[in-house]
Structures are given as structure tokens and as C-alpha cells.
Interface confidence: low
């Protein structure tokens, strides 16, 4: 892969260790926490990044109203089980044998159960709504400039194909970015919207995962775009299965 050959580092994932011991002396990088080889020419999967993180010593509007089936990651960090490709395994369990099913971005989509719980397939998250509130500015950002800048960010920094950025909504001070990617749309080599959203989330929090790059400096026509709150909603191809007790809580 294209890990920097001169000093052998992973441009897209600083939570790695690398050495030039791959085929032909090429740079090979492995994720902290798992030791799995990663492709440094693209984003590392969210599952491996979480595993690495856990190893190291949150009116007539044009804004989207999240569906009743939208999930928010309320469970926070956990040490996930990933498959050999670095994807989340459909069933996750903790060390006390409490298990639950997750979607492709690792967010719980069922009630918690015991080891008998079955998760037949990894359900794909095909629609992600990133809801941002920016800090007060002298005036509102120009919507088309904001739209262009955020699309550029996802295209160039996260290498997400432009067709997967479905829309950018703006109603000061709220910005919403919609990412959509069905199973049938995602081709081999395409960045997953879940991985792009996770890198963006970490960037917004000032915890960039990129090697040696400065933090995210997002500007619209030279004006800094500073985010003070982020909420991410995940919509799965198959609705989640929670008990009524949770839904009414």
C-alpha cells in the first residue's frame, strides 16, 4: 500500500506501528490494539480504530428530522470484536457475557441479551445524518459556500466519493450533512460512510486520526467554522429491534 516509504508511517492512521518488512521491503502498518494490517492508502475501519482507542491508556424547516428508527450512539466506547476484514461482527459481547447486535458502524441495534442472542447478519447503516451546531459568527455562512466546503472536505480529506454526500442543510447555527450509501452502491475500494463519519467526528473533537497532519481547520470563505456540538444519527437498511420499554423510556 502507499504508506510513506521514506519514513514508513501510515498517513491515514496514526494509531499504527509500521516497518518496511512487507513484500519487497514495502512499508507495512498494523493497528494498535489489534496488530491487524491496515491499508494506509484509505481510511482504517471504525472497528479497528475503536479497538486501538480502547487499547491506549461524545417550523417548515429544511433541516432533516431523524426517522423514528434512527439510532444515536448512547453506549459510548467499547472494545469491539472485528472480523478479519476489520468490520464489526454482528454480535458483540462484553466480558460478563452480555451480548447485543450492532450495525455496520458498531452502534447497538437490539436490546442486550446473553450468549444465546443471535445476530444473523451485519445490518448495513445506509444513511448517516451528522447534525452540527457551529459557534456564533458575525453573520450566517453562505449556504452554497458551506455546502461546497463540506463536500470538498469529505472528498479530499476522507476520500469519500462525492455521490455519497447526499445533502448539506443549513439553518443557522445548525448544519446537517447527510451521507447515503446502500450496499448496492458501494463498490470495492469505496470508503464506507461509517468510517468517513467517524474520522469526521474525531476531527471535529480535535482528535484527528491522521498522521502528522494538523487538526481540522475548516473555513468557509476564510471564516473559521467552529463546531460546538455534534450529534450523529444512524439509519439502518433494516429497522432496529428494541423492546417497547426502551422506545417509550
Amino acid at each position: 500500500h502507499t504508506a510513506a516509504q521514506d519514513n514508513c508511517t501510515c498517513p491515514t492512521n496514526k494509531m499504527t506501528v509500521c516497518s518496511p518488512d512487507g513484500p519487497g521491503g514495502r512499508c507495512q502498518c498494523r493497528a494498535l490494539g489489534s496488530g491487524m494490517a491496515v491499508d494506509c492508502s484509505t481510511l482504517t475501519s471504525k472497528c479497528l480504530l475503536l479497538k486501538a482507542r480502547m487499547s491506549a491508556p461524545k417550523n417548515a424547516r429544511t433541516l432533516v428530522r431523524p426517522s423514528e428508527h434512527a439510532l444515536v450512539d448512547n453506549d459510548g466506547l467499547y472494545d469491539p470484536d472485528c472480523d478479519p476484514e476489520g468490520r464489526f461482527k454482528a454480535r458483540q459481547c462484553n466480558q460478563t457475557s452480555v451480548c447485543w447486535c450492532v450495525n455496520s458502524v458498531g452502534v447497538r441495534r437490539t436490546d442486550k441479551g446473553d450468549l444465546s442472542l443471535r445476530c444473523d447478519e451485519l445490518v448495513r447503516t445506509h444513511h448517516i445524518l451528522i447534525d452540527l451546531r457551529h459557534r456564533p459568527t458575525a453573520g450566517a455562512f453562505n449556504h452554497s459556500d458551506l455546502d461546497a466546503e463540506l463536500r470538498r472536505l469529505f472528498r479530499e480529506r476522507y476520500r469519500l466519493h462525492p455521490k455519497f454526500v447526499a445533502a448539506v442543510h443549513y439553518e443557522q447555527p445548525t448544519i446537517q450533512i447527510e451521507l447515503r450509501q446502500n450496499t448496492s452502491q458501494k463498490a470495492a475500494g469505496d470508503v464506507d460512510i461509517g468510517d468517513a463519519a467517524y474520522y469526521f467526528e474525531r476531527d471535529i473533537k480535535g482528535e484527528s486520526l491522521f498522521q502528522g497532519r494538523g487538526g481540522l481547520d475548516l473555513r468557509v470563505r476564510g471564516e473559521p467554522l467552529q463546531v460546538e456540538r455534534t450529534l450523529i444519527y444512524y439509519l439502518d437498511e433494516i429497522p432496529p429491534k428494541f423492546s417497547m420499554k426502551r422506545l417509550t423510556a
Epitope: V17, S19, D21, G35, A37
Partner: antibody, heavy 121, light 107 residues
Framework: QVQLVESGGGVVQPGRSLRVSCIAS????????MHWVRQAPGKGLEWVAV????????DYVDSVKGRFTISRDNSKNTLYLQMNSLRGEDTAMYYC??????????????WGQGTMVTVSS | DIQMTQSPSSLSASVGDRVTITCRAS??????LAWYQQKPGKVPKLLIY???TLQSGVPSRFSGSGSGTDFTLTISSLQPEDVATYYC?????????FGGGTKVEIK
């Protein structure tokens, strides 16, 4: 909690065979590469063998190649080391250790308590 | 095969002293180095992996550094419970060779 428990050690004559086992609990055994490490009395640690998480790859230290076989049964959360043609220099405490996640090469974060193998006539 | 050489083989220091143990690989191994502590009669315990990453639960007085061929384990302030033998190990590829060990005692 996460643990590894070895068994099967004992006294065996040179040239004979022995199989030691390691039962894992508290983690997804089938996701981790597993290793055997040994330590002769009063000596340092010596890596012996590795098996990939899915059993697809094995490797051994030169001194045991052709004599020892590492294997695993993921359905039983168990790691094995079959030792044939045993020699006096194989006398050691044998530890199983957890290695890389979905691989083999990584540091050993969980160790068993060890099982003693003594090769003596 | 890559050889791992530790020095010193033993040392004696006072409580509170800064202790440094070195490990040298005969060929470059990038950051693929781990440090283990083995107390008398006990099982080895992982202290540091990837040359400098502290394993969860390990006191912050332990630190690791280095890359390539030269690595260091430092105990910033030696405590009585640190009496043990310390081993380095490369883990980039087989064989996963250990260093010969450094025995640390209290004066």
C-alpha cells in the same frame, strides 16, 4: 475474567511424546493468534510456536520444527501443543499466551500460569 | 534470525532511583518491540508494546522508547515491587525472539 489455563505437563522419557493444552475463557478465543512460550528452570523466556486465529498459519522456533505441532479447536476454546521426540533440553515451564487480534504477530497481553514438562529418563 | 541483546544482565539500585534497561536488535524492527516483567515465581506480564505504548493497568513510572534497533525501558522511580526480571521481545515476525533478560534488585 480473561484467563488461560494450561494442563497436561508431567515427566516424560526422552524420545516420547506429550500433548499440553490451554483452555481460554473470558474473550473471543477464535479472534486471537495464540502462542506457546517456554522457560527452562532458571533461564529466560523462549518463544516456541504461534498459530493464527483461524488456524491458517503456524510457525515454530527452529529447535522444535518437525517435532512439535501447534493446533487449536476454536469450538472448544482450546490451544494444543503436541510434542514428539522429546529431548532433555525441552524441559521447561510451558506457557500459552494470547497474541495478535485476527493475526498472530503481536505482543502477548494474556499469559497462562504454565504447565511444567520434565524430560528425564 | 534477528537477535535481541539486553543490557545489563543485572543491576542493583535504590528505591526512588531512575533505572534504564536497553535492548538492541541485530536488524531494524521498527516499533515492533514489547517489554515484559516477570517477578520471582510468577508469570510474565506485558508492560509496554509497540516500543512505547503502556499496557493498560501498568504504572506510569514505566516507559519505553526507541525505534529500529535500539530500545530503552525506563523506570522513573524504582519501587520495591519492581524487583523482577525484565525481558524485551520483538514481535514483527517469526521467530518472536526474547532478549536474555535483565534482573533488577534493590540495594
Amino acid at each position: 475474567q480473561v484467563q488461560l489455563v494450561e494442563s497436561g505437563g508431567g515427566v516424560v522419557q526422552p524420545g516420547r511424546s506429550l500433548r499440553v493444552s490451554c483452555i481460554a475463557s473470558g474473550f473471543f478465543f477464535s479472534s486471537y493468534g495464540m502462542h506457546w512460550v517456554r522457560q527452562a528452570p532458571g533461564k529466560g523466556l523462549e518463544w516456541v510456536a504461534v498459530i493464527w486465529y483461524d488456524g491458517s498459519n503456524e510457525d515454530y522456533v527452529d529447535s522444535v520444527k518437525g517435532r512439535f505441532t501447534i493446533s487449536r479447536d476454536n469450538s472448544k476454546n482450546t490451544l494444543y501443543l503436541q510434542m514428539n521426540s522429546l529431548r532433555g533440553e525441552d524441559t521447561a515451564m510451558y506457557y500459552c499466551a494470547r497474541g495478535g487480534y485476527n493475526s498472530g504477530w503481536w505482543a502477548f497481553d494474556i499469559w497462562g500460569q504454565g504447565t511444567m514438562v520434565t524430560v528425564s529418563s | 534470525d534477528i537477535q535481541m541483546t539486553q543490557s545489563p544482565s543485572s543491576l542493583s539500585a535504590s528505591v526512588g532511583d531512575r533505572v534504564t534497561i536497553t535492548c538492541r536488535a541485530s536488524q531494524g524492527i521498527s516499533h515492533f518491540l514489547a517489554w515484559y516483567q516477570q517477578k520471582p515465581g510468577k508469570v510474565p506480564k506485558l508492560l509496554i508494546y509497540a516500543a512505547s505504548t503502556l499496557q493498560s493497568g501498568v504504572p506510569s513510572r514505566f516507559s519505553g522508547s526507541g525505534s529500529g534497533t535500539d530500545f530503552t525501558l525506563t523506570i522513573s522511580s524504582l519501587q520495591p515491587e519492581d524487583v523482577a526480571t525484565y525481558y524485551c521481545q520483538k514481535f514483527n515476525s517469526a521467530p518472536l525472539t526474547f532478549g536474555g533478560g535483565t534482573k533488577v534488585e534493590i540495594k
